[in-house]
């Protein structure tokens, strides 16, 4: 799926007016992108509660076990995002997969990650058939990792 | 930053023609987008080695620690992306920060990210001054995870 | 217009480091985008990547030489340098520095468009 | 690491010949870029991305391909084509430049 871009216009780029409305199901198909997350959603159940699963996806067999929450913008490129969300505060016990363990600390893994907001451009709200897409850095959680607590100097 | 873009075009969207040329910084200052991972890269010299810190960056002190490798595309939006390469292939002991424990892998976490590649328009190759971009995944590893060796049924 | 000259010594001995210093004019490599690398050639053989340094002082190196090499630039100099230690006789050939960082409508190319001379480097002892 | 096999590795040919060579690489790709060398001289861009003629290059150079699979054509040789030449790619990850083993292309 692309999208068309000119060169060389002022505010990088601009592009011509319009009379057609462009279809809704166009701007969808081209926002909607990867619409899953890390591991497939289908098994998340696994990691629904505190402890290390010995099968299924990644996000339940991890020590460090979480579950995926979507985050949905229709304006927003891509569409659909998912957040890691913590299951447990300590780290499972790699032996038994389901006491937790006070040595290790389960934390989320935080990421700037790169979206694109569909916006009226900039002073030509409702004069023009033209959007912008404006580049902002939105904070996802990736995973949760099971790491050791911090010693402060 | 943003990127003006034409509601209704037949290819969602096309552009007008232009004479000049964009400015290098321009582009690049839309595509450069978050030029950081997750967790601060001058610090990654702690997470080099199969070691769990007990201080530095989330990726040095987990017990699956990984460092960042960078893949540059500046052609591609986000230009620069960070894959985690694990540095150990079974998980830390918690106790010592040092021994591998067996009952626990080292797994990378992958995950398709939205990104878009500039390209030139199809069937337009050098008869107008204007790009496409085109949105694509691409497979990055977030991060390195403990996880119990999966059980065969 | 571009130009890119290498400059260093001709002979170096085995275990020795070489230092290698490229001068350039008609471009800045502080232009976003821009970026200049090291080639080399020994006699008879192919052209080998060796180094990059980008605008944002990013930096890449040929994995299998990665301990060996530094590259560093000087904006103000308009000077880039690489380093290369614990030299051997198979580090013989040209060395080649040259810019890339042209950019079309389509986007950057990662072609090295413009190329010094070369400077011939023996390592005998 | 992606590896770049050109071939053939030498080529005898007339002037007014057809040449191609070929340039395939150990894994998909986006574009090839395409240098020629003589004796003594560092190397001229000849194609960037695939396809497009660098500056000044005469339009009997042209190139083409995708995925694995590259080509250089010189439509009718002449004289001052007898060279080596070098196929060339940019990998982002880990990011790389590599260059082909050359074909040097000899007067019959």
């Known amino acids: 799926v692309s999208l068309r871009i000119q060169e060389g216009c002022s505010h990088l780029p601009s592009c011509c007016p319009s009379k057609e409305q462009e279809p809704p199901e166009e701007w969808l198909k081209w926002s909607s992108a990867s619409v899953s997350p890390p591991e497939p959603l289908s098994h998340t159940h696994h990691a629904e509660s505190c402890r290390a699963s010995k099968d299924g996806p990644l996000n339940s067999r991890a020590i460090s076990p979480w579950s995926y929450e979507l985050d949905r913008d229709l304006n927003r490129v891509p569409q659909d995002l998912y957040h890691a969300r913590c299951l447990c505060p300590h780290c499972v016990s790699l032996q038994t997969g389901s006491h937790m363990d006070p040595l290790g600390n389960s934390v989320p893994l935080y990421h700037n990650q790169t979206v694109f907001y569909r916006r009226p451009c900039h002073g030509e709200e409702g004069t023009h058939r033209r959007y912008c897409l404006e580049r902002r850095l939105y904070r996802v959680s990736l995973a949760c990792v099971c790491v050791r607590p911090r010693v402060m100097a | 930053v943003s990127l003006r873009i034409q509601e209704g075009c037949s290819h969602l969207p096309s552009c007008c023609p232009s004479k000049e040329q964009e400015p290098p910084e321009e582009w690049l200052k839309w595509s450069s987008a978050s030029v950081s991972p997750p967790e601060p890269l001058s610090h990654t010299h702690h997470a080099e080695s199969c070691r769990a810190s007990k201080d530095g960056p989330l990726n040095s002190r987990a017990i699956s620690p990984w460092s960042y490798e960078l893949d540059r595309d500046l052609n591609r939006v986000p230009q620069d992306l960070y894959h985690a390469r694990c540095l150990c292939p079974h998980c830390v002991s918690l106790q010592t920060g040092s021994h591998m424990d067996p009952l626990g892998n080292s797994v990378p976490l992958y995950h398709n990210q939205t990104v878009f590649y500039r390209r030139p328009c199809h069937g337009e190759e050098g008869t107008h001054r204007r790009y496409c971009l085109e949105r694509r995944l691409y497979r990055v590893s977030l991060a390195c995870v403990c996880v119990r060796p999966r059980v065969m049924a | 217009q571009v130009t890119l000259k290498e400059s260093g010594p001709t002979l170096v001995k085995p275990t020795q480091t070489l230092t290698l210093t490229c001068t350039f004019s008609g471009f800045s490599l502080s232009t976003s985008g821009m970026g200049l690398g090291w080639i080399r050639q020994p006699p008879g053989k192919a052209l080998e990547w060796l180094a990059h340094?980008?605008?944002?002082?990013?930096?890449h190196y040929k994995p299998a030489l990665k301990s060996r090499l530094t590259i560093t630039k000087d904006t103000s100099k308009n000077q880039v340098v690489l380093t290369m230690t614990n030299v051997d006789p198979v580090d013989t050939a040209t060395y080649y520095c040259?810019?890339?960082?042209?950019?079309?409508?389509?986007?950057?190319?990662?072609?090295?468009?413009?190329w010094g001379q070369g400077t011939l480097v023996t390592v005998s002892s | 690491d992606i590896q770049l096999t050109q071939s053939p590795s030498f080529l005898s040919a007339s002037v007014g010949d057809r040449v191609t060579i070929t340039c395939s690489a150990s894994?998909?790709?986006?574009?090839m870029y395409w240098y020629q060398q003589k004796p003594g001289k560092a190397p001229k861009p000849l194609i960037y991305r695939t396809s497009n003629l660098a500056s000044g290059v005469p339009s009997r150079f042209s190139g083409s391909g995708s995925g694995t699979e590259y080509t250089l054509t010189i439509s009718s040789m002449q004289p001052e084509d007898f060279a080596t030449y070098y196929c060339q790619l940019y990998h982002s990850y880990p990011p790389t430049w590599t260059f082909g083993q050359g074909t040097k292309l000899e007067i019959k």
């Open positions: 894994s998909s790709v986006s574009y």
């Open positions: 040259a810019r890339m960082g042209q950019l079309h409508y389509y986007g950057y190319d990662y072609a090295m468009d413009y």
């Open positions: 340094i980008w605008w944002d002082d990013v930096k």
